[in-house]
Structures are given as C-alpha cells and as structure tokens.
C-alpha cells in the first residue's frame, strides 16, 4: 500500500496508473466503499461522499491511462485509506494529514516561549524536526518547545514531519519582537549633541505602545527617568520629559532621542523599556554614554572619561607629531608640564579608537 | 465543432461596470470548467477567473472582489461581470474552455471581445 | 502564486532552423505545463499538454520536455506557419499562470 502524507488545508493528488493509456471506467472510493468520484461516459461524475465537493481529477490524462485523485482543503480527518478501482484492480493509497500549528501568536517578545502542536490521524506515530532560521535543531513529537526566543530565531522555521519513511514539510514565520541590538555605547566628547537610536528588529502594521527611559548617572546615587512616550501606529509623542537634561525625540520610527549636550554628569547607562499594546512583557534596550574632557588647568594637562568604560580600555595623552605619550587603563591620564602643541587625548580598544579630543598647549614664557 | 462567442465588450469609463458573456456549442458545456483570459495591448496573455463543473470559482489577485464570472448552463453560457474597472483593465478578454476541469489547461479559446477603460 | 519566467521574449530564425523556447517556474509544477501558439488578432491555439503530449492535429515537430521548474519547447524544423508568439502555462492549480511569452519572428 502506497503511503501519501499532506498537509491541513493544502492539497493532494493521489494517483492510479492503468496499464493501457487509454481512457476506461474508473472510480476512487474511501475505505467504507463510499464513491467519492469516477467517470461515467466521458465525465466526472461525483459520489455521495462527504469529501466530493473537496475532490477533482485531471480529464487530460485519462486517456494517457493516469486517473488521480485531487483532494483540495486537507483536513486531519481526509486521513484514510482510499482505492482506485480500475481495469477490474485495485489500487490501495493511505492518505496522512497532518497539521502544525504554533498554540500563541507567532509574534512573541525576545525571551518568551514558543510552542509548535502537531495535529494528526489516529493511530500515527510521527517525528517533528524543527529548523530554526539560525540553524537551530529542534526535535520532538505532538509538541515541540523553544524555551526562550532569541532575536535570531526571528523568521521562517522550518519543521519536518515524518511518518512510514515519508516526510512533508511545513513553514511557520515566526516574529521575535526586540530591538536590533542588546546594548549600545555613544562616545562622545564634552559639549557635543547625542544621539541615541533604539531601531526594532522587526516591523509591524500597526505598532501601539508606550515607553520609557530610565538613566542612572555613573555620579548619581539612584536612577530616574529621563523620558516617557506614547507609540501609536508607528507615530511617536512625548508624555513627560525632564528638566535636566532636556532630552528630544522624533516623532518616526525608529525611537530617536536627542540630548543637547555631552556633560560628565549625564554619564552612565540607560535603559529604554517598550511595552506594545496586547503583549504580556517588555523590550529593553541598554545604552552607555561615555564622555570625555581633556582640560589644561596651570602645568597639569588632564584628560577624563566618565561613564561606562571596560577595563582594558586604554587612554592616552599624545603630542601631535611628537613621540612624547602617556596611556594607562585608566580613566584619568595626565602630563605635568606638557609641551606647548596640539595634544589629543585619545580613549581606544586594542588600538581602534573610540574617542578623541584635542588641546591647545601654548608655550608658558 | 467547439465554438466560444464573447460579446459585451466596450468603451466604459474608469469606474463603471461592464458584462462579458461568451456563448458556448458544439460540447457538453455543463461538464467543462470555463475560464477568462484577457491581453493588454501588446502584452501577454493573463489568466482572469475559472468555474468548473460544479459551480466552484477562483479569481487571479488583481481581479479578486471586482470581477465576477457565472455559468448558466441551461443556456450554454458563461460571463464575467466587471465593476470598479481601472485603466489597467483594458484589454482583448477571451473565453476558454478547460479539457475538464479546472486542474487542467484549457484547449478551446473564442476570438475575443475588447474591453476598453477610458475618461 | 506561482510565476512563470519564459525566454527569450523574442528570437529570429528561419525556415528549417530548430528552435527551443524555455519555461521557468518559481516551485515544482510536477509536470502540469501546456504551450500555446498565438497569431496577431486570434485566440491562443493549445500545442502540448502535461509537458510532452502532443494535443491533437499538432504537427509531430512540436516537441516538449522537462520536469520540475525547468521545461522546453522545441520546434525541430521551423515551417513558414510557425512563425507566431508562444506562450507556457502552469496549471498545477486552478489559479493558473502564463509565462510572458515569447515571439518567434522570420530571420
């Protein structure tokens, strides 16, 4: 017996192959002998099975000996044996359908669970793999879990199900609502604008929500709220915003915020928290600012970094076209008595640099 | 002899409605699936609607919600009733009969009748 | 839905030459293509069915083949009646598609 897995609510054709390619009587019928169709004269003709208005054949190839079976619309249910009867034999075909369905809504926040349930026939013993768009495997049976989504496993997945050393295959897109990066660092240099960019690592039609950014300063003994907005079909406006800084923020996606000036005292870490309307849970994204200040105070030329700076960052004092440096893993370097020229101060990881400012020493007469 | 005559075509303006029909002899109309197919001027041949024996109808996306297509076997006939027609709709519109169904292709074709969409 | 990629969109050729025409399809048609032949003012003439069955009173040098996504025409040796614009169909559903076609001209 022929086995023929399809899928819930695709369609199958089932074949059955006289031995002359000529056109001769045939019917298919399930396996409690009801007519589901046949020929009778030269035309289709329908029997009084409940699957007869979901079933077609092909006319062009009856007379090439070929008289399929086209069931539209699978439902688990179609799961049967059926037989073609044809030049006085019988062709036996087992049909399996089976349906994978995801049991939430398939956009869930980073960190969330995914659930995936096999529907299928009575008596079938079938195998999921799963194929996540990152290359992750994942196996099981009825069900198939992913504990915590990642933003990678964003997109299409692709889970095969196999039965009787058969298999058929089903595409579930999948849409791991976060942002684009965990966490970002903005260098900037003392007095510059800053600017923070929270870009979303998916898009939506409607996308409804509110959202807020706490800061805690590396010199503040507590955290505060810096902004809160509101997000209404992808347009953006300002609730609340602090006097100090006086941060702004556009209005388009994706969330943009201005602070007019790097200062020392707004140096540390952020968090921007989006919570979208009918979603349990929130999306975070971490920002640092780090800012620097190289000033000339009497002899002692200093340079500064506040804010959040790994420890193998380097900082260096360095006179333009001169040999003459200073660096250490610090977040102070300075030079007693520096030499009259431009000086940079210079913040870097593994020699790429992230930061640099630069001094006028003038001579002392 | 397999015949397909459609007529109802004509100038109509951006909007307005029109109906094709297409009177078919020669075979058993009632047990084949019919189609439209229009051609643009100087471009491809595009695949409109279906009906097949039993009644059931599929429609190509950039028709679905405008365009209707109907049988009436007692009178050998098949038609499409177009409304919210568009520029775009202007176009040689043919009717095909399928050799069977509408899981196959389709081996008779008419003449044509020409449907032009202008203000 | 389906496409059909068809080419070349246009070829010259003259009497006796062999001409092949292709047909590309965007997933599996399993076989369900039909050719067609069109000349200027007239409906579409059926040539071939199921890749390679010649529909009836089409002359023997039409000729099609393949299987898959990638299916041929062949014409092996071009008449003067053949010159005209061919067309591929998928109809591996009911919500058939054409390929652009192609128009075979006189060299």
């Known amino acids: 017996k022929k086995v023929v897995l399809g899928k819930k609510g695709d369609t199958v054709e089932l074949t059955c192959n006289a031995s002359q390619k000529k056109n001769t009587q045939f019917h298919w019928k399930n396996s409690n002998q009801i007519k589901i169709l046949g020929i009778q004269g030269l035309f289709l003709t329908k029997g009084p099975s409940k699957l007869s208005d979901r079933a077609d054949s092909r006319k062009s190839l009856w007379d090439q000996g070929c008289f399929s079976m086209i069931i539209k619309n699978l439902k688990i249910e179609d799961s049967d044996t059926y037989i073609c009867e044809v030049e006085n034999k019988k062709e036996e075909v087992e049909l399996l359908v089976f349906g994978l369905t995801a049991n939430s809504d398939t956009h869930l926040l980073e960190g969330q669970s995914l659930t995936l349930t096999l529907e299928s026939p009575p008596g079938s013993s079938p195998s999921v793999k799963c194929r996540s768009p990152g290359g992750k495997n994942i196996q099981g049976g009825r069900t198939i879990s992913v504990p915590q989504l990642e933003r990678q496993d964003s997109g299409t997945w692709t889970c095969t199900v196999s039965q009787d050393q058969k298999t058929v295959e089903f595409k579930i897109d999948i849409v791991v609502l976060a942002f684009q990066k965990a966490s970002s660092t903005v260098y900037k240099k003392e007095g510059e604008q800053v600017e923070f960019s929270f870009p979303l690592a998916f898009t939506l039609e409607k996308l409804t929500g509110s959202g807020e950014l706490w800061w805690q300063a590396e010199r503040a003994s507590s955290s505060k709220s810096w902004i809160t907005f509101d997000l209404k079909n992808k347009e953006v406006s300002v609730k609340r915003v602090t006097q100090d800084p006086k941060l702004q923020m556009g209005k388009k996606l994706p969330l943009h915020l201005t602070l007019p000036q790097a200062l020392p005292q707004y140096a540390g870490s952020g968090n921007l928290t989006l919570a979208l309307e009918a979603k349990t849970g929130k999306l975070h994204q971490e920002v640092n600012l780090v800012v620097m200040r190289a000033t000339q105070f009497q002899e002692n030329l200093t340079c500064e970094v506040w804010g959040p700076t790994s420890p193998k960052l380097t900082l260096s004092l360095k006179l333009e076209n001169k040999g003459a440096t200073v660096s250490k893993q610090a977040k102070a370097v300075w030079v007693l008595n520096p030499e009259a020229g431009m000086w940079q101060c210079l913040l870097s990881d593994s020699g790429q640099v992230l930061l640099e400012s630069n001094i006028k020493v003038v001579p002392t007469w | 002899e397999v015949q397909l005559l459609e007529s109802g075509g004509g100038l109509v303006q951006p909007g307005g409605s029109l109906r094709l029909s297409c009177a078919a002899s020669?075979?058993?109309?009632?047990?084949?699936?019919m189609s439209w197919v229009r051609q643009a001027p100087g471009k491809g041949l595009e695949w409109v609607a279906s009906?097949?024996?039993?009644?059931?109808?599929f429609y190509a996306d950039s028709v679905k919600s405008r365009f209707t297509i109907s049988r009436d076997n007692s009178k050998n006939t098949l038609y499409l009733e177009m409304n919210s027609l568009r520029a775009e709709d202007t176009a040689v519109f043919y009717c095909?009969?399928?050799?069977?169904?509408?899981?196959?292709?389709?081996?008779?074709w008419g003449q044509g009748t020409t449907v032009t969409v202008s203000s | 839905d389906i496409q059909m990629t068809q080419s070349p969109s246009s070829l010259s050729a003259s009497v006796g030459d062999r001409v092949t025409i292709t047909c590309r399809a965007s997933?599996?048609?399993?076989?369900?293509i039909a050719w067609y032949q069109q000349k200027p003012g007239k409906g579409p003439k059926l040539l071939i069915h199921?890749?390679?069955i010649l529909h009836p009173g089409v002359p023997s040098r039409f000729s099609g083949s393949g299987s898959g996504t990638d299916y041929t025409l062949t014409i092996s040796s071009l008449q003067p009646e053949d010159f005209a614009t061919y067309y591929c169909?998928?109809?591996?559903?009911?919500?058939?598609?054409f390929g652009q076609g192609t128009k075979l001209e006189i060299k």
């Open positions: 095909s009969r399928h050799y069977g169904g509408s899981y196959d292709p389709m081996d008779y």
């Open positions: 020669g075979f058993s109309f009632s047990n084949y699936a």
């Open positions: 009906i097949n024996e039993w009644g059931s109808t």
């Open positions: 997933q599996d048609i399993n076989k369900y």
């Open positions: 199921y890749t390679s």
């Open positions: 169909l998928q109809y591996d559903n009911p919500l058939q598609t």
